[in-house]
């Protein structure tokens, strides 16, 4: 699997999408886990509803929420109030029994540009008001890290 980068602004929300083959993964619950180290285990953060038919219902663990469009084949994870410590490697998983298939490897980057956190009224630089969005979901443009490319793991 290539790693897909999703970038979100610190303090705002970030939406991560994981597409999959809906037929191949029919009847399977999904999960979002955080990779602990390069070779370490993937620690479960949140998983979809225990009843697969109710996978469309949003389930939450702290600031992380998950919902699954089982017909369209898209798993969506929302990270609210993104913080620097949220930066790192994650996986979208499809569960079957005690096994888990990786749907997508994800690198979450937390953007920390200080101009994103200035009140528009206090701002001293012109033409920057577009940076001061409310904490709406950031539909990040993701990019894939090519095979062999070493990703930059952000530090917090």
């Amino acid at each position: 699997h290539n790693t897909t980068v999703f970038q979100g602004v610190e303090g705002q929300s970030l939406q991560v999408s994981c597409p999959y083959d809906s037929m191949k993964h029919w009847g399977r619950r999904k999960a979002w886990c955080r990779q602990l180290g390069e070779k370490g285990p993937c620690q479960r953060v949140v998983s979809t509803h225990n009843l697969w038919l109710l996978s469309f219902l949003r389930r939450r663990n702290g600031s992380t929420a998950i919902t699954d469009d089982t017909l369209g084949g898209t798993l969506t994870i929302t990270l609210r109030n993104l913080q620097p410590h949220d930066a790192g490697f994650y996986q979208c998983q499809s569960l079957h029994g005690s096994e888990a298939d990786t749907l997508r490897k994800v690198l979450v980057e937390v953007l920390a540009d200080p101009l994103d956190h200035r009140d528009a009224g206090d701002l001293w630089v012109p033409g920057e008001s577009e940076s001061f969005e409310d904490a709406h979901v950031e539909h990040s443009i993701s990019r894939s890290l090519l095979e062999g490319e070493i990703p930059f793991p952000p530090t917090s």
Epitope: F6, Q7, V9, G11, Q83, P84, A87, E109, V110, L111, A112, D113, P114, L115, H117, R118, D119, D122, W124, S131, S140, I141, S142, R143, F152, P154, T155, S156
Partner: antibody, heavy 115, light 112 residues
Framework: EVQLVETGGSLVQPGKSLRLTCATS????????LHWVRQSPEKHPEWVAH??????????YYAESVKGRFTISRDDSKSSVFLQMNSLKEEDTAIYYC??????WGQGTLVTVSS | DVVLTQAPLSVSVTPGESASISCRSS???????????LYWYLQKPGMSPHLLIY???NLASGIPDRFSGSGSETDFTLKISEVEPEDVGVYYC?????????FGAGTKLELK
């Protein structure tokens, strides 16, 4: 007029502690995120620590080199930000600047760690 | 950490001539929002750093338009079109894309 005035820098021995204070005026302190940046003699600036506003629960972040030894805090009622530095090392020797890392910078205070 | 490499380490310029300073990043500083989190500072002797350029190419308040910033995702240039005596000092690039914020090693500008 915007002012940031750092105080508290001095000569200390390795392993000792020091508390830096940055008193500010002339800008809306309470909603500005503030940082400490240090600069060793003849070296480039190095980001040290960062504290957010009350609305962000005064969240703090640190450079790896100071994590566990330095603590950043702020007092909005006094428009001041602080840097508590424990277990000081010789490599902590630098001028310490209080800044919003954009337009507001203090003149710096010199911390010298030497035996 | 993001490493910023500046070149040259020092530059000597005759007043009225132009000067260019380069800054290369170990990774892309372009965000998915189309913002490039590369900043330029001037530190005059005995002073604290002073912001010149924000987000790669935007002139900070009060900075003369002799200064300009440009670049791509990883390679950046600060240009001073007609150097004046007051421009003497050390120029630093800095990235504020991700923590920890990092600065380049600096380029010292002197007058001939």
């Amino acid at each position: 007029e915007v002012q940031l005035v750092e105080t508290g820098g001095s000569l200390v021995q390795p392993g000792k502690s020091l508390r830096l204070t940055c008193a500010t005026s002339g800008f809306p302190f309470s909603n500005v995120w503030l940082h400490w940046v240090r600069q060793s003699p003849e070296k480039h600036p190095e980001w040290v620590a960062h504290i957010k506003a009350k609305s962000d629960n005064y969240a703090t972040y640190y450079a790896e080199s100071v994590k566990g030894r330095f603590t950043i805090s702020r007092d909005d009622s006094k428009s001041s930000v602080f840097l508590q530095m424990n277990s000081l090392k010789e490599e902590d020797t630098a001028i310490y600047y209080c800044t919003d890392i954009l337009e507001y910078w203090g003149q710096g205070t010199l911390v010298t760690v030497s035996s | 950490d993001v490493v910023l490499t500046q070149a040259p380490l020092s530059v000597s310029v005759t007043p009225g001539e132009s000067a260019s300073i380069s800054c290369r990043s170990s990774r892309s500083l372009l965000t998915s929002k189309g913002i490039t989190s590369l900043y330029w500072y001037l530190q005059k002797p005995g002073m604290s750093p002073h912001l010149l350029i924000y987000r790669m190419s935007n002139l900070a308040s009060g900075i003369p338009d002799r200064f300009s910033g440009s670049g791509s995702e990883t390679d950046f240039t600060l240009k001073i079109s007609e150097v004046e005596p007051e421009d003497v000092g050390v120029y630093y690039c800095a990235q504020f894309l991700v923590y920890p914020y990092t600065f380049g090693a600096g380029t010292k500008l002197e007058l001939k």
